[in-house]
Interface confidence: medium
């Protein structure tokens, strides 16, 4: 299980129309459910339940986004509509170039994502927890324009990190 180096870039537009970017670095793990490769895209926060329905929420976004899913405690969803792997697949089917799961409240999901799949996804499926997950969700919950860059080796250039 290789380390995934994730950079989350928050775009703040200035009155002049220019953008200032604030980059936060965090680490996760590439799961065996997906490929160990780099990916980048605009963050789309997805509710685990929102990945259940084959309805209006289908095909909502054009291809190339990074799905962020905060998994709930298993007892809050005792009969999930899809497995965690199924949810990752559904997100990729809808155009996600990568999926990041916050497993802080559902650590069992780590094993589910790492059970060697005969047919792993061709896109990365990363999981984060603890302080890294908190950093990620703090940014995502702002509901502002943000991008995620996932790399399987540390960023070459030193990046300025801002604690969000």
């Amino acid at each position: 299980k290789e380390t995934a180096f994730v950079e989350v870039v928050l775009f703040e537009s200035s009155p002049s129309g220019d953008y200032t970017t604030y980059t936060t670095g965090l680490t996760g793990r590439f799961s065996r459910a997906g490929a160990t490769l780099s990916a980048e895209g605009e963050i789309v926060q997805m509710h685990p339940l929102g990945l259940c329905n084959n309805n209006d929420e289908e095909d909502l976004y054009e291809y190339g986004w990074v799905g962020v899913v905060k998994l709930e405690q298993p007892e809050l969803d005792p009969k999930p509509c899809l497995t965690v792997l199924g949810k990752a697949k559904r997100a990729v089917q809808r155009g996600a170039t990568a999926v990041i799961f916050d497993v802080s409240e559902n650590p069992e999901a780590i094993d589910q994502l790492n059970q060697g799949s005969e047919d792993p996804l061709k896109r990365p499926v990363v999981y984060v927890k603890g302080a890294d997950a908190i950093k990620l969700m703090n940014i995502v919950n702002k509901q502002k324009v943000a991008r995620a860059r996932i790399q399987h080796r540390p960023p070459r250039q030193p990046t300025e990190y801002f604690d969000m």
Epitope: F11, E12, S13, S14, P15, G17, Y19, Q45, M46, H47, L49, G50, D56, E57, Y61, E72, L76, D77, N141, K142, Q143, K144, V145
Partner: antibody, heavy 121, light 108 residues
Framework: EVQLVESGGGLVKPGGSLRLSCAAS????????IHWVRQAPGKGLEWVGR??????????EYAAPVKGRFTISRDDSKNTLYLQMNSLKTEDTAVYYC????????????WGQGTLVTVSS | DIELTQPPSVSVSPGQTASITCSGD??????VHWYQQKPGQAPVLVIY???QRPSGIPERFSGSNSGNTATLTISGTQAEDDADYYC???????????FGGGTKLTVL
């Protein structure tokens, strides 16, 4: 059919109270955050407040003009949302809408037809 | 707190393109949603997250957001598009929804 239906509006005197209801059908109500939005006669839309789903903590948040006077609650077993309005003022006169938010996006994809609240002496 | 400003009215001839703007400081940092409201009816979401169109909304509706201005564009405007249009954003400090003042689109 996905639907929200408000009720409970009417005429009330300044300082009075009123409780609005919003009945949901056609979707799993408990999974969604629901908002109240109002519109004074001939005016624009104004956000009143929201309640998150229970799984998201059931947190309530309010617009400054109604904070401390209005209370939002939900009964997931009855698929119903409530807006308790106390210490009503004439400027609270409006059509009140309940609206469902898309998961994690405070964009409202389903709206009720609205219920008129008139505060007048 | 962000404030959203819309022109009170916009007129367009049938078949032409209508552009309705929504401006606010650093608006490009936010996700902007657009609602259509016809007289006596509840609002309808026509664009969310700057440019996403809900199912059932015609392709002639599109959105963009950059710098300080978000724009709702209706190409090939039809008589049925005659309505009020509101932009909105979610402001996270403090958490609350902010609506623009609304624009009355008149299809001549």
């Amino acid at each position: 059919e996905v639907q929200l239906v408000e009720s409970g509006g009417g005429l009330v005197k300044p300082g009075g109270s009123l409780r609005l209801s919003c009945a949901a059908s056609g979707f799993t109500f408990s999974d969604y955050g629901i908002h109240w939005v109002r519109q004074a006669p001939g005016k624009g839309l104004e956000w009143v407040g929201r309640i998150k789903s229970k799984t998201d903590g059931g947190i309530t948040e309010y617009a400054a003009p109604v904070k401390g006077r209005f209370t939002i609650s939900r009964d997931d077993s009855k698929n119903t949302l409530y807006l308790q309005m106390n210490s009503l003022k004439t400027e609270d006169t409006a059509v009140y809408y309940c609206a469902r938010a898309i998961y994690y996006l405070e964009a409202f994809d389903v709206w009720g037809q609205g219920t008129l609240v008139t505060v007048s002496s | 707190d962000i404030e959203l400003t819309q022109p009170p009215s916009v007129s367009v001839s049938p078949g032409q393109t209508a552009s309705i703007t929504c401006s606010g400081d650093s608006l490009g940092s936010y996700y902007v949603h657009w609602y259509q409201q016809k007289p006596g009816q509840a609002p309808v979401l026509v664009i969310y997250r700057n440019k996403q169109r809900p199912s059932g909304i015609p392709e002639r509706f599109s959105g963009s957001n950059s710098g300080n201005t978000a724009t709702l564009t209706i190409s090939g405007t039809q008589a049925e598009d005659d309505a009020d249009y509101y932009c909105a954003v979610w402001d996270d400090e403090p958490h609350h929804d902010v609506f623009g003042g609304g624009t009355k689109l008149t299809v001549l």
